[in-house]
């Protein structure tokens, strides 16, 4: 088992909103849970966009999840990652 590296980034979306993206890379096997949580609770599926789990050329895999949130609310959100029985949480950088 190879655990993922997780990276959270933010980008401007429409006025007053930002898109936060959580990327996981370098993991094996390919099964992974990646999702956004607000105030500790998972967001509904229809408010998130997922990328496919793709090979990254090193025998490991990569994927991403993104959601749009209100600017100024970033600290309420965390990216939640689960892989091979382990989990981690990743906040949005300021």
């Amino acid at each position: 088992t190879v655990p993922p590296m997780v990276n959270v980034t933010r980008s401007e979306a429409s006025e007053g909103n930002i898109t936060v993206t959580c990327r996981a890379s370098g993991f094996y096997p390919w099964n992974i849970t990646l999702s956004w949580r607000q105030d500790g609770v998972s967001l509904s599926h229809d408010t998130q966009q997922w990328g496919d789990v793709l090979p990254d050329g090193n025998g490991t895999y990569q994927t991403w999840v993104a959601t749009r949130i209100c600017q100024g609310e970033e600290q309420r959100f965390t990216c939640y990652m689960e892989h091979s029985g382990n989990h981690s949480t990743h906040p949005v950088p300021s």
Partner: antibody, heavy 117, light 107 residues
Framework: EVQLVQSGAEVKKPGASVKVSCKAS????????IEWVRQAPGQGLEWIGA????????NYNEKFKDRVTITADTSTSTAYLELSSLRSEDTAVYYC??????????WGQGTLVTVSS | DIQMTQSPSSLSASVGDRVTITCRAS??????LAWYQQKPGKSPKLLVY???TLADGVPSRFSGSGSGTDYTLTISSLQPEDFATYFC?????????FGQGTKVEIK
């Protein structure tokens, strides 16, 4: 009202194991991570690890990884911390807490574990 | 691991005094900082989260500030029930780490 109620005090001999429970009520147990923290007598606080009760996935402090097991029973809304190969330095109050996004909003009352020969 | 250095370790103050406690992180924690109050024999009580947001039911005499690596908890007018130990905690990355605590005693 959110409540985390922990099991009672324990006295253990060096080398033994201890299992502390944390029963949650007043909220959806599987929705939030449960964290474990300890505090040695007169000392600061130390994060041990966490569990997602919905999936059983865990996240451990490397310092404790070889000796700690965190589990959860969704049928009773109870999380458990098991610490093995106890030594005197493990004498501490052990707390569970609910992870609300990016802070701990509710804490259990604490369980004193005393390790003494 | 991110180290949290809290100061002072203890202080003596009188009712009505303004009290300031500081917490310095060994790296940027992006304001993911909480402050807790703990009284003897009790579990920690959340006071402030996200560096400056007051938890529900916490009196307005408490305030938090800071960014990057340096953070402050201020009690504008110390009350008798505020004599306790205060801890900071970072949530930027695991292992989540705590300051060593500041004991606020009666002068």
């Amino acid at each position: 009202e959110v409540q985390l109620v922990q099991s009672g005090a324990e006295v253990k001999k060096p080398g033994a194991s201890v299992k502390v429970s944390c029963k949650a009520s007043g909220y959806a147990f599987t929705n939030y991570l449960i964290e474990w923290v300890r505090q040695a007598p007169g000392q600061g606080l130390e994060w041990i690890g966490a569990i997602n009760p919905g999936s059983g996935a865990t996240n451990y402090n490397e310092k404790f990884k070889d000796r700690v097991t965190i589990t959860a029973d969704t049928s009773t809304s109870t999380a458990y911390l098991e610490l093995s190969s106890l030594r005197s330095e493990d004498t501490a109050v052990y707390y569970c807490a609910r992870f609300l996004g990016n802070y701990f909003d509710n804490w259990g009352q604490g369980t004193l574990v005393t390790v003494s020969s | 691991d991110i180290q949290m250095t809290q100061s002072p370790s203890s202080l003596s103050a009188s009712v009505g005094d303004r009290v300031t406690i500081t917490c310095r992180a060994s790296g940027n924690i992006h304001s993911y900082l909480a402050w807790y109050q703990q009284k003897p024999g009790k579990s920690p009580k959340l006071l402030v989260y996200y560096a400056e947001t007051l938890a529900d039911g916490v009196p307005s005499r408490f305030s938090g500030s800071g960014s990057g690596t340096d953070y402050t908890l201020t009690i504008s007018s110390l009350q008798p029930e505020d004599f306790a130990t205060y801890f900071c905690q970072q949530f930027w990355t695991t292992p989540y780490t705590f300051g060593q605590g500041t004991k606020v005693e009666i002068k």
